[in-house]
């Protein structure tokens, strides 16, 4: 029997975000659930992690009287990142001198373990996702998503920092996963491969797609990044599945085009306040979601992602320039800038749709494998 | 009362250098992005280049048709913009203006004053 | 770049007319949109910002609408010193682009 697909009935489109093809799906095998080492051979296309203190640059950790109401998801210590041991080196993060805790780097010595312990956590992002074993959950309620439209002034701050492109957003952007569970945005990056090599960090069915974006959020009951991590919902990532398409996405587009200026790794620039929700699917409502970790070091874990089931179309021009604009550390271009899906360890992925059914009419009660925990909670 | 005036406008061969100034009065001036707009003759309007505020750093940013040839520049204890105009083309004769732009308070790019403009002909 | 198309490039009209010129633009710049007058001789001034905001001292008679990809200037009652080029500008991201000009002349 044919494998669901994640789109399903849920057509791209919408915005200058979506098209309405479905999110692919492969009949590759995961290890999802086998305990594993972190990033071990033979652990998919590539690892990798990002800049957060985890995702990514998070918001600087500073003395509450420096910045305060100022999060920038960046300067965090980082660490380096394991390579996957059967795929080349991926030199975009070469040592560098220094202790270790000064950086991290996608594929080579020393282990994420080592430097950032919380690596070797039981639940670790990103994961593959497999619809049919998700537990539906009719509770999680449309994302709702306020001031994401930004005006173009004041600009926003663009910067490769070695290890991907990141957006610091403004204060302002306000995010809930549903009641009671409110968050700010802080920043948004990207994760990409090479040419002719996928790079997103969560898997579908063992499919990668081209990229995935990632904004990252933290929980209102928080005032600062340092006080959140490893706190279970301190962090919550919103994830969509970039794919090509026919068309220029415009909206990517202003970022894109801005890439050229911030080449050399460490560089960054100004651009133009854009509507950041229209870098995300236009469907907030079909999502997959589950409690994971910051898919670089710290990797800290606790945070809530939520991952679109609708993907994003880019066209294959702008995916070219997303993964061969820039450049990172000791003349290695930035590319295959993602970590190793990890093991569920038992946890199950929540869906606000049925993702698990066939999209034609059945019984009106599907059979779900796994039952729904959240609640909406 | 708020104002802008240019001078430094004048005849140069194609391949010469020009460098154009601005002279700002009436408001504060490292709270605004400062631009140069020109106008050839008989056409439109164009942007040429801007310069952002004292919040953003004072960083240029230039429009595809100047960028690596023209630079532009501010004095803020001067109260003054510039711009270096290095390799000239014909297609560069226009009247230049200068233009103030976007500060703190702004949400967009708009051009709420201009100075009268300052003539550049590039001609052998 | 974001391209701008005014229409009509240019019209007459008379003394106490109802005048609208349309800017299309090739992208939604939601309501970051400018018009400019511009007498021959002079330097542009800025009649209306973000839409549909009239710029300080500027005559009641003119007004903006619209967002996203169209937008429209209007005159309400056409005065003599209303005779001039119109130009619109998007200020939603740079290079900063203006339409090519509506000329307003005397019927």
């Known amino acids: 029997q044919r494998l669901p697909r994640m789109q399903e009935d849920s057509p791209l489109g919408g915005g200058s975000s979506g098209e309405d093809d479905p999110l692919g799906e492969e009949d590759l095998p995961s290890e999802e659930d086998s305990p594993r080492e972190e990033d071990p051979p033979g652990e998919e296309d590539l690892p990798g992690e990002e800049d957060l203190p985890g995702e990514e640059d998070l918001p600087e950790v500073k003395p509450k009287s420096e910045e305060e109401g100022s999060l920038k998801l960046e300067d965090l210590p980082t660490v380096e990142a394991p390579g996957d041991p059967q795929e080349p080196q991926n030199n975009a993060h070469r040592d560098k001198e220094g202790d270790d805790q000064s950086h991290w780097r996608y594929g080579g010595d020393p282990p994420w373990p080592r430097v950032s312990p919380a690596c070797a956590g039981r639940f670790q992002s990103p994961v593959d996702i497999r619809p049919q074993l998700a537990a539906f959950c009719p509770a999680l309620r449309p994302l709702e998503l306020l001031g994401f439209q930004l005006p173009p002034l004041p600009e926003l701050r663009l910067r490769n920092n070695g290890h991907s492109v990141q957006l610091t957003l403004p204060p302002g952007l306000e995010m809930a996963l549903g009641p009671g569970r409110e968050y700010r945005a802080l920043q948004l990056h990207l994760h990409w491969g090479a040419a002719g090599r996928p790079g997103s960090e969560h898997t579908v069915e063992g499919h990668r797609f081209p990229a995935e974006i990632h904004v990252v959020h933290l929980s209102t009951a928080f005032a600062r990044v340092d006080e959140a991590l490893g706190r279970p919902g301190g962090l919550a990532v919103l994830a969509a599945f970039l794919e090509e398409g026919p068309e220029e996405n415009s909206a990517y587009e202003q970022l894109l085009s801005r890439l050229e200026e911030i080449a050399e790794e460490g560089s960054e620039t100004q651009v133009p306040g854009l509507d950041i929700s229209a870098l995300l699917p236009s469907d907030f409502s079909r999502y997959f979601q589950y409690e994971g970790s910051l898919t670089t070091p710290p990797c800290a874990q606790g945070v809530i992602w939520t991952v679109f089931n609708q993907t994003v179309m880019l066209s294959a021009k702008q995916l070219h320039t997303l993964s061969d604009t820039l450049w990172g550390p000791g003349d290695s271009r930035l590319q295959l800038n993602f970590r190793a899906t990890q093991p569920l360890n038992g946890r199950v992925i929540e869906a606000s749709f049925p993702a698990g059914v066939d999209s034609s009419p059945r019984a009106a009660e599907p059979v779900q494998l796994n039952s729904c925990l959240a609640a909406g909670d | 009362e708020v104002q802008l005036v240019e001078s430094g406008g004048g005849l140069v061969q194609p391949g010469g250098s020009l460098r154009l100034s601005c002279a700002a009065s009436g408001f504060t001036f490292t709270d605004y992005y400062m631009h140069w707009v020109r106008q050839a003759p008989g056409r439109g309007l164009e942007w040429v280049a801007f310069?952002?505020?004292?919040?953003?750093?004072?960083?240029?940013q230039y429009s595809a048709s100047v960028k690596g040839r023209f630079t532009i520049s501010r004095d803020n204890a001067e109260n003054s913009l510039y711009l270096q105009m290095n390799s000239l083309r014909a297609e560069d004769t226009a009247v230049y203006y200068c233009?103030?732009?976007?500060?703190?308070?702004?949400?967009?790019?708009?051009?709420?004053?201009w100075g009268k403009g300052t003539t550049v002909t590039v001609s052998s | 770049d974001i391209q701008m198309t005014q229409s009509p490039s240019s019209l007459s009209a008379s003394v106490g007319d109802r005048v609208t010129i349309n800017c299309h633009v090739s992208q939604n710049i939601n309501v970051w949109l400018s018009w400019y007058q511009q007498k021959p001789g002079e330097a542009p001034k800025l009649l209306i910002y973000q839409a549909s905001n009239l710029h300080t001292g500027v005559p009641s008679r003119f007004s903006g609408s619209g967002s996203g990809t169209g937008f429209t200037l209007t005159i309400r009652s056409l005065q003599p010193e209303d005779y001039a080029t119109y130009y619109c500008?998007?200020?939603?991201?740079?290079?900063?682009?203006f339409g090519q000009g509506t000329k307003l002349e005397i019927k």
């Open positions: 500008q998007q200020g939603q991201s740079y290079p900063f682009t």
């Open positions: 310069i952002r505020n004292k919040a953003s750093g004072y960083t240029p």
């Open positions: 233009v103030r732009g976007g500060h703190a308070g702004s949400n967009y790019w708009y051009f709420d004053v």
